[in-house]
């Protein structure tokens, strides 16, 4: 069998095969040793018994999307049946005091590979043997502690494969310089040691994406905005836009990045090299926000200009592109190509509560039967739209441990002046957070208040 017969996936074009688009990967035209690495189709009954105590699940993730030319990293994590884990020696053991369907196990090992490898023969003293090889026959690399690595991972995409010996978790990075743009499929087959052969235990695949557009994400934050994810914001308060460029392999680390903003409110274009920007909308309505990110990234070098024409006519050699030497690249050339990323959003701007202030606090006269309680009136003003609810959160002086939260609807006139009465049980210092809210906004103010001891002899008391 060949690799492509075993790993059901895409194949490379002739161009890609010649250019070996994944550095360090091999063509799936290579032979696969099916005696050592048996191949089971989906639905084959043997999968049921490929692992003691249940099925192993492989989880494949990547840091996709990847800007073409950058590295993309794939991670595979094995999830073992309940009560099983990998120990420091790479053996699979039962967790202590863990009960599964079979109850507690007397044997601490699910798979004791250390014992197997000590028993193994046919080695030539270097740890090399006919079975310490990958599916294509290449020998295992002898890193320190390689004997504790008991899983073989075969990654396959775009007609190429990569083999890796590992523990229950592995990572593989791939350069995407010559990878086709668009969604692609990565498939991974995982084998475990089984005596002098290997047994498939899991297969997993995942879509990854290579793009020539910079992956851009924008977060938007505005003080007093009730819901930051609904793209509805408040008039007359700055919105902070923060641009995150998804570049996990730091491909653009040495690039100058320019951000070109159009806020859709006839304020023109704003160009910056800073990933954050503040903008205030002064009118209500719906606005189209557009961001273009530009970065000079490492990229392919253009072909050199054709040589100057000789003065005497010479026989034609065909198109310039037919000469393979003319298209060759100097590997160390550092050419730059402008890459662009785009973000677009429709933003709705509405009236909101812009500000809230406590302008007065008054101790309320209390009758004798409630000597431990103090009633305090907070006189509050606000700016912007009219609030429909008020909440007070009373907490300790550090404002961290909440003691009491009360919310109630309010009916406020256009002057936006209201009195909020709250009870304080006992003397001491309190932190009071007071918020005024409506459908779209939530404005907060805080104050520390000191409630003095009540004099039980005094029927009434007025505090500052």
């Amino acid at each position: 069998k060949r690799f492509h017969d075993v790993l059901g996936n895409e194949r490379p074009s002739a161009y890609m095969r010649e250019h070996n688009q994944l550095n360090g990967w091999s063509s799936d035209e290579n032979d696969w040793n099916e005696k050592l690495y048996p191949v089971w189709k989906r639905g084959d009954m043997r999968w049921k018994n490929s692992w003691k105590g249940g099925r192993v699940q492989a989880v494949l993730t990547s840091d996709s999307p990847a800007l073409v030319g950058s590295n993309i990293t794939f991670a595979v994590n094995l999830i073992f049946p309940r009560c099983q884990k990998e120990d420091a020696n790479g053996n699979i053991v039962y967790e202590k005091n863990c009960r599964n369907e079979a109850g507690l196990s007397a044997d601490p090992y699910v798979y004791n590979w250390t014992a197997w490898s000590e028993d193994s023969d046919g080695e030539n003293g270097t740890g090399q043997s006919h079975h310490n090889v990958f599916p294509d026959g290449k020998p295992f690399p002898h890193h320190p502690g390689w004997r504790r690595w008991n899983f073989i991972y075969v990654f396959h995409t775009l007609g190429q494969y990569f083999q890796k010996l590992g523990r229950c978790s592995v990572r593989v990075s791939v350069n995407t310089a010559n990878v086709t743009l668009g969604p692609q499929l990565m498939e991974v087959t995982v084998y475990r040691r089984h005596g002098r052969a290997y047994v498939p235990i899991a297969q997993v695949k995942d879509v990854y994406v290579v793009t020539d557009q910079i992956p851009v994400f924008v977060t938007m934050f505005q003080k007093n905005d009730r819901n930051s994810s609904d793209e509805t914001f408040l008039k007359d308060l700055p919105i902070m836009f923060d641009v995150l460029i998804h570049d996990p392999s730091h491909f653009l680390n040495y690039s100058t990045i320019n951000y070109k903003w159009s806020f859709g409110d006839n304020t023109g274009l704003f160009v910056s090299t800073n990933h954050t920007v503040n903008h205030t909308y002064v009118l209500n309505g719906t606005f189209s926000l557009n961001l273009t990110v530009k970065a000079a990234a490492p990229g392919p070098c253009p072909p050199p200009p054709p040589p100057p024409r000789p003065s005497k006519p010479t026989p034609s050699l065909g198109p310039a592109g037919d000469n393979p030497l003319e298209l060759s690249r100097i590997p160390d050339e550092n050419c730059q190509i402008n890459r662009y990323g785009h973000f677009q959003a429709t933003i709705t701007i509405v009236e909101g509560i812009l500000e809230v202030n406590i302008i007065q606090m008054t101790d309320v006269l209390m009758p004798v039967p409630w000597p431990e309680s103090s009633l305090i009136d907070f006189v509050v003003t606000c700016q912007g739209s009219i609030p429909t609810e008020v909440c007070t959160i009373i907490s300790d002086p550090t404002c961290e441990i909440t003691q009491n939260t009360v919310c109630s609807p309010v009916d406020v006139d256009e002057m936006c002046l209201l009195t909020v009465r709250r009870t304080f049980n006992g003397s001491g210092t309190y932190c009071v957070n007071l918020t005024l809210g409506d459908d779209t906004s939530l404005a907060l103010t805080s104050t520390l208040i000191s409630v003095p001891d009540r004099d039980p002899a005094s029927p009434l008391r007025m505090a500052n």
């Epitope: 996936n9 969604p183 994406v209």
Partner: antibody, heavy 115, light 107 residues
């Protein structure tokens, strides 16, 4: 440039079978999956399945699992989709589309099922 | 199967208008969504992959956004050649499924 050229229109009777072909050129045939999608008159798109010409690995929409067979011929860079037990509701334009999510499409083959 | 619900099913607009088409998946499809344009009697043409990335040659007035279950195709300023039917597709899991389509007509 990439081209997918499909076979000509077909008229079939209910219960019969039809085999539609899609010949690929402009790229190496075994590189990409080939999807089959159909579109009934005035309707939307419906995914039938996909085949990997490299090893004839297939994925089918369960709705067509028992009636559709996709095959690939590497020697001619052609994929085929055969649909059996035809009924009137199979009247549609059948498209092939290259890649995991199609980036290039064939021109379409009209299949009419009528008694 | 994952259902892709596209809205509106039809839309009248004028040249220069900004148009938004939405697609809602019945379950999470991450960003594994593509958008296609189809003109009468023609095969679909791929516009967008992975929810927001344009295929080469697609004008930048076309933009896609969304993740999870809610996706949007926006045409920022309609051109005469943009009047067509638009489809979304999820390729997160088999069977791949398409939205019902949005027919964009001249007002």
């Amino acid at each position: 440039q990439v081209q997918l050229v499909q076979s000509g229109a077909e008229v079939k009777k209910p219960g019969a079978s039809v085999k539609v072909s899609c010949k690929a050129s402009g790229y190496t045939f075994t590189t990409y999956w080939m999807n089959w999608v159909r579109q009934a008159p005035g309707q939307g798109l419906e995914w039938i399945g996909a085949i990997n010409p490299s090893n004839d690995y297939t994925e089918y929409n369960q709705k067509f699992k028992d009636r559709a067979i996709m095959t690939a011929d590497k020697s001619t860079s052609t994929v085929y989709m055969e649909l059996s037990s035809l009924r009137s509701e199979d009247t549609a334009v059948y498209y092939c589309g290259r890649s995991y999510s199609p980036d290039y499409w064939g021109q379409g083959t009209t299949v009419t099922v009528s008694s | 199967d994952i259902q892709m619900t596209q809205s509106p099913s039809s839309l009248s607009a004028s040249v220069g208008d900004r148009v938004t088409i939405t697609c809602k998946a019945s379950q999470n499809v991450d960003n594994h969504v593509a958008w296609f344009q189809q003109k009468p009697g023609k095969a679909p043409k791929a516009l967008i992959y992975s929810a927001s990335y344009r295929y080469s040659g697609v004008p930048d007035r076309f933009s896609g956004s969304g993740s999870g279950t809610d996706f949007t195709l926006t045409i920022s300023s309609l051109q005469p050649e943009d009047f067509a039917t638009y489809f979304c597709q999820q390729y997160k899991s088999y069977p791949f499924t398409f939205g019902g389509g949005t027919k964009l007509e001249i007002k």
